[in-house]
Every structure is written in structure tokens, then in C-alpha cells.
């Protein structure tokens, strides 16, 4: 008999696809960074699987990830942020698959917040402002933002505006009168650091005034 089935779990594991994706978030909790990974196949059996990162770390050779449901993550100050780290999926001491990744190229910024819209009656426009925690950060400071807005009744007709500042002006004549709008914003690294879009900010809702409305007041949120 062949020894192929002697360690069924491990042999089965070797037949599976353990490809995974990760993103980093720098200074996400004070000076702590985080790294989050997940298997690309959400149905993979993760019971005995662990993640480990080695290399490009400060003071230690390797670090183990914590597990939350199907997510693996680390929060640490020990990322060197220079050079590539080796991230491996392991069963016990055996590595099933590894990836060499520069953590500065897989950065996902934190979501913008405090999004608001103020109507200026005299100027016939709407001033959109929002905040980002990255203005206070040491590393990922420069971002490109994607502001998306739609008339609430138009399920998937989003208009997108890209900008590098945290302020945008929308002209009243470009919007429908007496209509409800939803607006949201997300961010992506735009200088030195590379990576992915942040989560969307919470949506903000505003109503445009009637064309002949002299007060022009918006419902405050």
C-alpha cells in the first residue's frame, strides 16, 4: 500500500488551493501597524491552518497571526517597512504556500469620516468636506480620494470625482432640484506607498432645494 493516505488531512491540504491575499494598515492604532490576510477561496477548511510572517521585522525573526473567523491578522510595531517579508500558510511546522510581499505596496488606508455637505445659497453650490486620520500620520500621508454621489432613487448611477484635497464643490445646476442625494468617499495611497481603496466612509444624505426656493436651507445632518 502507498503511504499517501497515512496522513489524510495533510495530504488533502496539499491538494487544495491555499492562495491568499493581504493588506497592511500603517499606524492604524497609535504607532501600531496591522496586516490582514484571508484565503482567496472562502470555503477552504482553515481548521489547522496558521499564517506566519518572517523577514523585514524589527527585533524578531517571525510573527504569528491571530485568527478571527476566516480572517488572519497581526497588530504590531515591528514591521520594518523596508524590503520584502515572507508570509506563509502553515500546518504545524510545514509551510503549504508562501508569498514575498513588501508591506508598503499593499496598504489599505482607513476610511474617511465626518463627511458633510453644506448648501451655499448665494453661490448656488454645495460644499462637500470630510476628514481623514491620515493627515496626522507619519507614513501614509498623501492620498487620492474618490467622492461618489447619486440621486437616491438611482440605484447604481454613481458619479465619481477624484481629488487630493478633503474639500469639493458641487454646482447646484449639476444636480436635480428637490431631490435626495447620497454621497460617500474612499481613499487610496497616492505617493510612495501603493495599495488598495479604503472602505467607504459612512454615507451622508442631503436634499437639494427647489429651484425657486429663496431660503435654500438644507436639512442638517
Amino acid at each position: 500500500e502507498s503511504g499517501y493516505a497515512q496522513n489524510g488531512d495533510l495530504e488533502d491540504a496539499e491538494l487544495d488551493d491555499y492562495s491568499f491575499s493581504c493588506y497592511s494598515q500603517l499606524e492604524v492604532n497609535g504607532s501600531q501597524h496591522s496586516l490582514t490576510c484571508a484565503f482567496e477561496d472562502p470555503d477552504v477548511n482553515i481548521t489547522n491552518l496558521e499564517f506566519e510572517i518572517c523577514g523585514a521585522l524589527v527585533e524578531v525573526k517571525c510573527l504569528n497571526f491571530r485568527k478571527l473567523q476566516e480572517i488572519y491578522f497581526i497588530e504590531t510595531k515591528k514591521f520594518l517597512l523596508i524590503g520584502k517579508s515572507n508570509i506563509c500558510v502553515k500546518v504545524g511546522e510545514k509551510s503549504l504556500t508562501c508569498k514575498k510581499i513588501d508591506l508598503t505596496t499593499i496598504v489599505k488606508p482607513e476610511a474617511p469620516f465626518d463627511l458633510s455637505v453644506v448648501y451655499r445659497e448665494g453661490a448656488n453650490d454645495f460644499v462637500v468636506t470630510f476628514n481623514t486620520s491620515h493627515l496626522q500620520k507619519k507614513y501614509v500621508k498623501v492620498l487620492m480620494h474618490d467622492v461618489a454621489y447619486r440621486q437616491e432613487k438611482d440605484e447604481n448611477k454613481w458619479t465619481h470625482v477624484n481629488l487630493s484635497s478633503t474639500k469639493l464643490t458641487l454646482l447646484q445646476r449639476k444636480l436635480q432640484p428637490a431631490a435626495m442625494y447620497e454621497i460617500k468617499v474612499r481613499s487610496i495611497p497616492d505617493h510612495y506607498f501603493k495599495g488598495f481603496w479604503s472602505e467607504w466612509s459612512p454615507s451622508y444624505y442631503f436634499r437639494t432645494p427647489e429651484i425657486n426656493n429663496s431660503s435654500g436651507e438644507m436639512d442638517p445632518i
Epitope: 490582514t36 480572517i71 476610511a111 472602505e199 467607504w200
Partner: nanobody, 121 residues
Framework: QVQLVESGGGSVQPGGSLRLSCATS????????MTWYRQGPGKTRELVAV???????TYADSVKGRFTISRDNAKNTMDLQMNGLKPEDTAVYYC???WGGGLNRAPFDYWGQGTQVTVSS
Amino acid sequence: QVQLVESGGGSVQPGGSLRLSCATSGSIFSLATMTWYRQGPGKTRELVAVITWRGTTTYADSVKGRFTISRDNAKNTMDLQMNGLKPEDTAVYYCNVKWGGGLNRAPFDYWGQGTQVTVSS
């Protein structure tokens, strides 16, 4: 299709408390951001509270110190404990679960049907 179901709404006197819950019928990805919004009579929908997968919370100024948002990732549920309720808290409360995409998971944006909260003496 994932469904979100809110519960816990009702009528209460000023100063009273209610606890809203939001449960999902399907498996919600752990990294999703969970949010409570509300819409009062004749008003636009507004943010009440947000909780990220990491447990970071954000509140609207009008509810700070009175409302507490929490979540249970193992059960895919979110709660909103509302204390010191005021008449101006009267609204339909909606839960929202969002994931912007990444890690080979498609983006999603799910909304509940809403639960009515009425604060009146």
C-alpha cells in the same frame, strides 16, 4: 441574498432605554463595517453610530454618551443600546453592513428594513 433584520424598536418615555439588534440570515464577512442610521419624520437619513471589525466606534454628536454600539463577530450581530432617549430620537432606525471589496471578496452593501423608535410622554 443576505438579509438584515432589525428588532427592539418600540415606544418609550423620555429618559427611557431601548436596545436595538441587527441580525443577518447569511454569513457576513468578518471585516464588514456595521452602521446604524436613522430617519426622523420629514428629515433626511442620518448616521447614528459605526463599528468596524476591529471594534473602533464612531458616534453622531447628538447621541454621544447616550448610545453604545457593539457587535458579535461570531454571531454576525450588531446592537445599539440607547439610553436617555429624547423626543428628537424618534425615527426609523436602519442597520447597514458594508464591505468595500478586497481579499478576493466582492463588495457588498446590505440594508435592513428598519425598526420604529418613538420617544414620547
